[in-house]
């Protein structure tokens, strides 16, 4: 398994800007993915989001989220996905083994995978932003 390069920790306001951008991009991706009619979300796929045993901004499961988005990129060439991956790269602060995700082979299952992960990713970025802003409020009180 590959390991991602070590990066310097970013100030939490930098992280917040990145997550705000990711939140916006995730909405764009989901809007486009939802154009594909007749596709239902699947219970078979779960995107890791926030780690309960870490403090913001280190609680975002960026390496795993990035691995799922890279899998979607194998199935879909929307350029917003490249941009999302670039932003997720900035949130990976230490060595982390790359998560291996098996790509669905069935056409309809591909669509379900993309829709499900896109929806969960959008929800995850909402949660991540809330956790960052509430963490920042707690730090100032």
């Amino acid at each position: 398994s590959h390991t991602l390069p070590v990066r310097l920790l970013r100030p939490s306001d930098d992280v917040q800007k990145i997550v705000e951008e990711l939140q916006s991009l995730s909405k764009m991706l989901l809007k486009d993915v939802e154009e594909e009619k007749g596709v239902l979300v699947s219970q078979n796929y779960t995107l890791p989001c926030l780690s309960p045993d870490a403090q913001p901004p280190n609680n975002i499961h960026s390496p795993a989220i990035r691995a799922y988005l890279k899998t979607i990129r194998q199935l879909d060439n929307k350029s917003v996905i490249d941009e999302i991956i670039e932003h997720l790269d900035k949130l990976i602060f230490q060595d982390a083994p790359e998560t291996n995700i098996s790509v669905p082979t069935d056409t309809h299952e591909c669509k379900r995978f993309i829709l499900t992960i896109s929806q969960q990713f959008s929800e995850c970025m909402d949660l991540a932003l809330k956790s960052l802003t509430s963490g920042a409020q707690q730090a100032t009180t």
Epitope: E35, Q74, L75, N77, S79, I81, D82
Partner: antibody
């Protein structure tokens, strides 16, 4: 029946401009595909010019040589993509095709669609 | 800059021959590769997409294979209507790769 129809070609003098249109019929502009312009000079190969994404953002990708002189745009209400070509040269003489490509690997071949092409001749 | 290198540029073959055309990308394109057949005065006709999927209505004598940077189009038994020019194309659509065509392979009668 889905189709793409190019128009706007013709003869133009070197240094002149043309605007080509690619009208979609039988389908509407929605997310999940790209519309591209490709050209083919007489007796030569296919040459990609530019693509525009049909979706929530109008992302564009230009061939390096096309940046500056060529501009792609779209009008969703008219289901049409345009190619504005400026400072035309003799070597721009070609048949210009527009084509639709999928943005996903699912149901892919329903997204590959080409027009018949429009002829552009740059000559004094 | 990204490049797709197609070879050979031309080949002569007889009806019934097995024909192989290759396409090499200067960086990985994750199977975002299509093969087309083109005849004079006509737009290209899709044969293969996503490196190995046969387009609807295309005879099974055409097949595609490959991944990463190296791809192949094979015609298992050349038919009279197969004499034409063939192109590979990437439709990766983003990043630093985008789009592009191979230089073409003209298949003529031996």
């Amino acid at each position: 029946q889905s189709q793409l129809v190019e128009s706007g070609g013709g003869r133009v003098q070197p240094g002149g401009s043309l605007r080509l249109s690619c009208a979609a019929s039988g389908f509407s502009f929605s997310a999940n595909y790209w519309i591209c312009w490709v050209r083919q000079a007489p007796g030569k190969g296919l040459e990609w010019i530019v693509c525009i994404y049909i979706g929530s953002r109008a992302d564009t990708y230009y061939a390096p040589w096309a940046k500056g002189r060529f501009t792609i745009s779209k009008d969703n209400s008219k289901n049409t993509v345009y190619l504005q070509m400026n400072s035309l040269r003799a070597e721009d003489t070609a048949t210009y095709f527009c084509a639709r490509f999928s943005s996903g690997i699912y149901d892919l071949d329903r997204f590959f669609l080409w027009g018949q092409g429009t002829q552009v001749t740059v000559s004094s | 800059a990204f490049q797709l290198t197609q070879s050979p540029s031309s080949l002569s073959a007889s009806v019934g021959d097995r024909v192989t055309i290759t396409c090499q990308a200067s960086q990985s394109i994750d199977s975002w590769l299509a093969w087309y057949q083109q005849k004079p005065g006509k737009p290209p006709k899709l044969l293969i997409y996503q490196a190995s999927k046969l387009a609807s209505g295309v005879p099974s004598r055409f097949s595609g294979s490959g991944s990463g940077t190296d791809y192949t189009l094979t015609i298992s038994s050349l038919q009279p209507e197969d004499f034409a020019t063939y192109y590979c194309q990437t439709y990766y659509g983003g990043g630093h790769i985008g789009w592009g065509f191979g230089t073409g392979t003209k298949v003529t009668v031996k």
